[in-house]
């Protein structure tokens, strides 16, 4: 194929791949008609003047995972057709000015996972057609004003995993076509008002894993097209009342791992398209009425690992489309009988690791589609008669690690469990805690005659109330959740992020695979 170097493989489709530790310089001669060249996992340490001079038809050039630390300014001369250039995973500390001069067709430039200490406006001033710029995983401490001013067509910019401590409010001002901006895993403590004002087409903004303490009230007010906003693992202690007010397209919002103590009224709304709201690992202590009432399409609400001790009866008003509700690992002792009445489409509820002593008999009355209920590790001694009877789709019920009181009052629950044993799972079964003579025995097979008779007065007859709700719009079902594989955090759908950890630690999480996006 017009001469293929011995240390490379060349395909009919004009693709050349050169790999191996024995390669210490760009192989020659390269086929003149090559359109794609990959130089991977070699010991090349520098690129000299014009090593690609004879392959001017090249469209894609990947020089990745090498020992590359030095590039001559004219290294990419004569590559006017080049659209994709990756220098990722090398050891570059400095980029020569003019390195990308003449690359008039360049659309994607990947400089991630190097050791770059700084970038300057002159570096990218010739790249007027650039659409994607990856700079994550470097050692950048600041971005000078003007660095991206010529990249007016840029749609994706990744600055994650650097050492940025502050951002100038002017640095993104000319990027009106930007759709994805990633600033995750830096050291940002605050973001000046106006920083994102020019980003009118932004769809994803990743700010997670910084040290942001305060959000300016109008920080996102110009980002009407924003769909995904990641603010997790920061130091945010309060949310300004209007901070999310102008985000009608938002469908995923992560706020987990912050220091939120309360959710101020009206904070989430109106967000008619929000599907997922992640609030675990904060310091929230109570949920007032209507706190989520603007989120009519919400399907996943994660409130686990907070300090919630009180939920107002109308806290979940408006959440008619909710499928997943995670409240585990909080400080709940009581639940009002009306608290879940609006959650007609709920499929999974996690209430484990709380301090619940009893449940209202009608707590799940309106929630006919429940498939999984996690109630393990609470203070439950018994459950009301018929609490699960109407839940025909229930296939997972976790009741272990509760102090079940196995007197004669437990018989109705014991009988129901006998008939529904497969739903309890095989890992851990509920066992009696009292009386002492049956402690540790399985609740399902216990001989209640051995236990102490009940001294409890039977409950007064109950009369169900007729519910009356204000008119609320109904929406078609959009997802179905059946799996209960759990995740530590939402997968923030990054093509260039390779460190997502998945776990199946049910005792800690209580979230399902459907939440992985």
């Amino acid at each position: 194929y017009h001469g293929c170097p011995s240390e490379c493989t060349c395909s009919r489709a004009s693709q050349v791949e050169c790999t191996g530790a024995r390669i210490v310089a760009v192989p020659t001669p390269l086929p003149w008609n090559a359109m794609s060249l990959q130089i991977l996992n070699t010991h090349i340490t520098e690129l000299n003047e014009s090593p690609f001079l004879n392959i001017s038809a090249l469209i894609a050039l990947r020089i990745e995972k090498n020992e590359l630390s030095r590039i001559t300014p004219g290294a990419f001369r004569n590559l006017g057709s080049l659209r994709y250039l990756s220098l990722a995973n090398n050891k570059l500390q400095v980029l020569p000015i003019g390195l990308f001069q003449g690359l008039d067709s360049l659309e994607s430039l990947l400089l991630s996972s190097n050791q770059l200490l700084q970038i300057q406006p002159a570096h990218f001033s010739q790249c007027s057609n650039l659409k994607e710029l990856q700079l994550h995983g470097n050692h950048l401490e600041y971005i000078p004003d003007g660095a991206f001013d010529h990249l007016v067509g840029l749609t994706k910019l990744n600055l994650g995993k650097n050492s940025l401590t502050h951002i100038s409010p002017r640095v993104f001002q000319h990027l009106g076509n930007l759709q994805v901006l990633r600033l995750y895993e830096n050291r940002l403590t605050d973001i000046p008002m106006g920083t994102f004002d020019g980003l009118v087409n932004l769809q994803e903004l990743a700010l997670q894993q910084n040290q942001i303490g305060l959000l300016s009230p109008g920080l996102f007010h110009n980002n009407h097209n924003l769909q995904r906003l990641y603010l997790s693992n920061n130091h945010i202690s309060q949310l300004p009342p209007s901070v999310f007010m102008q985000l009608p397209q938002l469908n995923r919002l992560t706020l987990f791992g912050n220091s939120l103590k309360e959710l101020s009224p009206g904070i989430f709304g109106p967000m008619p398209n929000l599907r997922e709201l992640w609030l675990y690992d904060n310091h929230i202590s109570s949920l007032p009425d209507n706190v989520f009432s603007n989120l009519r399409q919400l399907q996943v609400l994660i409130l686990s690992r907070n300090q919630i001790s009180f939920i107002s009866p109308g806290a979940f008003n408006g959440l008619t489309e909710l499928r997943e509700l995670s409240l585990h690992t909080n400080a709940l002792q009581d639940l009002d009988g009306n608290v879940f009445r609006m959650l007609a489409n709920l499929q999974n509820i996690s209430l484990q690791n709380n301090r619940l002593r009893q449940l209202p008999g009608n707590i799940f009355a309106n929630v006919n589609g429940l498939m999984a209920i996690q109630l393990q590790n609470n203070q439950l001694e018994n459950l009301p008669l018929g609490i699960f009877d109407h839940l025909g789709k229930l296939c997972e019920l976790r009741l272990y690690d509760n102090p079940w009181r196995c007197d004669s009052d437990i018989l109705p629950l014991r009988n129901w469990l006998l008939l529904n044993q497969p739903r309890l799972g095989t890992d851990t079964v509920p066992v009696c805690f009292s009386p002492a003579n049956v402690r540790g025995q399985s609740l399902i097979i216990i001989n209640v005659n051995v236990a102490v008779p009940s001294v409890h007065v039977p409950e007064v007859p109950s009369y169900p109330e007729t519910p009356w709700y204000p008119d609320t719009p109904s929406y078609p079902d959009t997802t179905s959740v059946s799996s209960t594989t759990e995740l530590t955090s939402p997968v923030e759908d990054y093509t260039d992020l390779t460190t997502i950890q998945v776990t199946d630690d049910r005792s800690v999480w209580g979230m399902t695979q459907a939440q992985s996006g």
Partner: antibody, heavy 118, light 107 residues
Framework: QVQLVQSGAEVKKPGASVKVSCKAS????????INWVRQAPGQGLEWMGW????????KYAQKFQGRVTMTRDTSTSTVYMELSSLRSEDTAVYYC???????????WGQGTLVTVSS | DIQMTQSPSSLSASVGDRVTITCKAS??????VAWYQQKPGKAPKLLIY???YRSSGVPSRFSGSGSGTDFTLTISSLQPEDFATYYC?????????FGGGTKVEIK
């Protein structure tokens, strides 16, 4: 239907205690929070706190902390509000009230007048 | 504590009049405001919850509006049985607090 029936009027001396009862019917007593609200003669309404009958857990307004005790008897579906160290400004009608589908008071008792006078 | 300031404290009106009562919260309470009607010697009666939703059985002449800090109760056409005292209440945060009341009297 939901009903809350309170005990009758009381006259107490300053420094004494009063215990007002509220008997619930028409619903499962243990499943819903019950609140106490008071109203001094010719004055507005003042929230005192709540009790969750299922567990006996309580939350009191700071103003009444240390002087008010809310209890329940599940066998009779009755909650009690005891106010100690009475003073003349505690003269009021005391209402028990149950939340509906939110933390607003949908169901009210008829009220109990407590008069504190020497 | 959140203060609820109601105005006017009293008003005189005639049957058929349109009556507006306002309530101002000292901080943002979202839509967590209820309105009650109380007649002498009786317990309060819930009229409006979540700022604008009428309670079951309440006539349509009663309406509520507002969010954040400013709320309004409107009686579109006053009826003889509407002469009473009206209270607003916030239930955003503890302690739950009431307005001072508005007494609607016959002119």
């Amino acid at each position: 239907q939901v009903q809350l029936v309170q005990s009758g009027a009381e006259v107490k001396k300053p420094g004494a205690s009063v215990k007002v009862s509220c008997k619930a019917s028409g619903y499962t007593f243990t499943d819903y929070y019950i609140n106490w609200v008071r109203q001094a003669p010719g004055q507005g309404l003042e929230w005192m706190g709540w009790i969750y009958p299922g567990s006996g857990n309580t939350k009191y307004a700071q103003k009444f902390q240390g002087r008010v005790t809310m209890t329940r008897d599940t066998s009779t579906s009755t909650v009690y509000m005891e106010l100690s160290s009475l003073r003349s400004e505690d003269t009021a009608v005391y209402y028990c009230a149950r939340w509906g589908y939110g933390a607003y008071f949908t169901y009210w008792g008829q009220g109990t007048l407590v008069t504190v006078s020497s | 504590d959140i203060q609820m300031t109601q105005s006017p404290s009293s008003l005189s009106a005639s049957v058929g009049d349109r009556v507006t009562i306002t309530c101002k919260a000292s901080q943002n309470v979202g839509i967590n405001v209820a309105w009650y009607q109380q007649k002498p010697g009786k317990a309060p009666k819930l009229l409006i919850y979540s700022a604008s939703y009428r309670s079951s059985g309440v006539p349509s002449r009663f309406s509520g509006s507002g969010s954040g800090t400013d709320f309004t109760l409107t009686i579109s056409s006053l009826q003889p049985e509407d002469f009473a005292t009206y209270y607003c209440q916030q239930y955003q945060s503890f302690p739950y607090t009431f307005g001072g009341g508005t007494k609607v009297e016959i002119k």
